[in-house]
């Protein structure tokens, strides 16, 4: 007889990423005997919750919890039954709920209570539903990207095992209601609110992070629509041949469009608005989202927000990836340089509705938003964050790494389940000869 090694026992964790436009469930798994190694936790499965984000259920909190049931039922199947009780389950809500919490804290609380009630009905180890701060969202996205790319811990052999300090990747996340930029920096932050000190695997990291509320893709589009209604009577970022009817209440209900709200507007009034395929006017409209007029620090990104110069390589994910992927894949346009990204945005903005539909068959209503989306991404990176051509060359647009979605969810779970120790692990990984 000979010993047959059993496969290592697996552990599981579940995170519900309650974004502004939709909720996604991620199930992670890792070998129980290697839980302190880097790059060991990976995505087991995922599920997109049907319908809108939980913040869209402000008037119907039970609808928010009901919407999660399908994915939770899938989780019961995806996680082995004997592991249910030991599987942590978290729900983290982001900028959609941050906005709701600003405008209607009671509704925000009711939604969180309703989803909490439903999540406690499942046999998992439910550990809470809460709203992440913008800073947490940024930092956990950064942790996810660097964990998956194994930037925190690596071993080499020079007569003995040692851990060289690898450089980390910056992380840029473009959600529906906010956008985050996070990167390692050497100089102390002039604004303490934007600095986070992390101890991971015995290494110290000084990280700059900032989250811009109302600068997520959906809120930006809504703000541009409000500006177009105010200044043009047509929408320069929409394709010519695209015709809409807009209920004013739908445009001005967001706190992000509050500044553009006419004084005495009729929320039930309808306005017809058509596109004009005008890249130059569109660029001007998008420029209006950024203010560079005052900076109380030695340097700023925009809106008076401190930011050190961007340094090192970056991974840009979520709607950054979706926008660039559309330009590359659907439109067949090169986007390797900032100049190409700008040219690609202009190209899309020049297309008529008929031309766009011919390029991307099927009546995809969101097609009308890619011009504004591309213009915004290009301006946010170049003018907003200050990427020049050289720095932009170090940006990769990615949806996944190591078959795991890049976003804040994995970093959040790693943190809450203590899967990233502050102290260095033993050299088990380096001396494993199996």
């Amino acid at each position: 007889t000979r010993d047959v090694r059993e496969p290592p026992a697996l552990k599981y964790g579940i995170v519900l990423d309650a974004g502004s436009s939709h909720t996604s469930m991620f199930i992670y798994k890792w070998p129980a005997d290697k839980e302190n190694d880097t790059g060991i936790v990976g995505q087991h499965s995922s599920c997109d919750v049907p319908g809108g984000g939980i913040s869209s259920y402000a008037d119907n909190p039970s609808g928010a919890s009901q919407s999660l049931v399908g994915c939770l039922e899938q989780a019961l199947q995806d996680v082995p039954k004997e592991r249910h009780a030991g599987t942590p389950l978290y729900l983290g809500a982001t900028a959609g709920m941050r906005l709701l919490n600003l405008t209607n804290p009671e509704a925000s609380t009711s939604v969180l209570m309703a989803v909490t009630h439903t999540l406690t009905q499942y046999p998992f180890d439910f550990r809470g539903a809460r709203i992440l701060s913008g800073q947490e969202e940024g930092v956990f996205g950064w942790v996810t990207a660097n964990y998956l790319l194994e930037n925190f811990i690596k071993y080499g052999w020079v007569g003995r095992w040692f851990r060289p300090r690898k450089g980390t990747l910056g992380a840029m996340d473009l959600g529906g209601a906010s956008t985050q930029i996070t990167f390692e920096t050497t100089s102390p932050a002039e604004d303490r609110a934007s600095e986070v000190q992390l101890h991971l695997y015995g290494q110290h990291y000084r990280v700059y992070t900032h989250s811009f509320l109302c600068y997520g893709r959906d809120q930006v589009l809504q703000r541009l629509l409000a500006s177009a209604l105010q200044t043009h009577g047509f929408h320069p970022c929409w394709p010519r041949g695209f015709s809409t009817q807009v209920l004013l209440g739908d445009v001005y209900q967001s706190p992000c469009t509050m500044a553009q709200r006419p004084q005495n507007f009729n929320s039930s009034a309808r306005v017809s608005l058509s596109g004009s395929s005008d890249p130059h006017l569109c660029r001007d409209l998008v420029s209006g989202l950024f203010s560079f007029s005052s900076c109380p620090f030695s340097r700023c990104s925009f809106n008076g927000v401190f930011q050190p110069p961007v340094a090192g390589n970056f991974v840009a994910f979520s709607a950054f990836f979706a926008t660039v992927d559309f330009l590359r894949t659907s439109m067949g346009l090169p986007v390797a340089t900032l100049q190409q990204l700008e040219a690609a945005a202009v190209n899309v903005c020049n297309q008529t509705w008929a031309q766009l539909q011919a390029r991307v068959p099927g009546q995809r209503a969101r097609l009308a938003d890619y011009c504004a989306g591309a213009m915004f991404v290009q301006q946010l990176l170049s003018r907003g964050y200050g990427f020049d051509e050289r720095a932009f060359g170090g940006v990769i647009f990615q949806k996944k790494a190591a078959d795991t979605a890049v976003g804040w969810a994995l970093g959040y779970m790693l943190n809450l389940t203590n899967l990233i120790p502050a102290d260095p692990p033993g050299l088990r990984k380096g001396t494993d000869f199996s």
Partner: antibody, heavy 124, light 111 residues
């Protein structure tokens, strides 16, 4: 208020062409919207046929593409349907309708303004 | 083309009761987390009238007793409480892909 009024013959012979007119009042067909033709067969089944957009672009149902044409006369604020080589299968009530994308974080194509309908029989 | 299948073909409901109409699409009519599904009401001798867009959004002027729900391929129109003027044929319609397609209709009669 947007109003659509239809006109055209109620009887067409097989192999001939069916021609219908939709006159729009209360809104200029060049200002916005999509100006559609939809038909409803005797069993009540509805079929979207085509639209001409406010800027003159056409969009046709692929199942009818080689037989259908949609045009407009902007001076009269009218748009027209021509369906060639008709058969008895084309017997239906034909509606013209004004559509647009209803905004609500995304854009939802709806047909909100309808003509009264024209019953067309294809028979020898 | 996306095929829309409605059930039942007809139903009879008493005044004040609930009417539930289902619509199934041959493929998902969702995109980017939004459902591109509309519901229309048609009374004899009249053109269809828009009731609901985006699966659950009530068109202005439509009474709150009408409600829509669902996502992906499965959608439902509920009418509660049913009133006399609701006797009509109801159609679902997807607008996610060209060409827009309609369900076969559900005729609602009052008992």
């Amino acid at each position: 208020e947007v109003k659509l009024e239809q006109s055209g013959p109620g009887l067409v012979k097989p192999s001939q062409s069916l021609s219908l007119t939709c006159s729009v009042t209360g809104y200029s067909i060049t200002s916005g919207y999509y100006w559609n033709w939809i038909r409803q067969f005797p069993g009540n089944k509805l079929e979207w046929m085509s639209y001409i957009s406010y800027d003159g672009d056409n969009n046709y149902n692929p199942s009818l593409k080689n037989r259908i044409s949609i045009t407009r006369d902007t001076s009269k604020n009218q748009f027209f349907l021509k369906l060639s080589s008709v058969t008895t299968e084309d017997t239906a009530t034909y509606y013209c309708a004004g559509g647009y994308y209803r905004y609500g974080l995304s854009y939802y194509y709806v047909m909100d303004y309808w003509g009264q309908g024209t019953s067309v029989t294809v028979s020898a | 083309d996306i095929k829309m299948t409605q059930s039942p073909a007809s139903l009879a409901v008493s005044l004040g009761q609930r009417a539930t109409i289902s619509c199934k699409a041959s493929q998902s009519v969702d995109y980017d987390g939004n459902s591109y599904m509309n519901w229309y009401q048609q009374k004899p001798g009249q053109p269809p009238k828009l009731l609901i867009y985006a699966a659950s959004n009530l068109e202005s002027g439509i009474p709150a007793r009408f409600s829509g729900s669902g996502s992906g391929t499965d959608f439902t129109l509920n009418i509660h409480p049913v009133e006399e003027e609701d006797a009509a044929t109801y159609y679902c319609q997807q607008s996610n892909e060209d060409p827009p397609t309609f369900g076969g209709g559900t005729k609602l009669e009052l008992k």
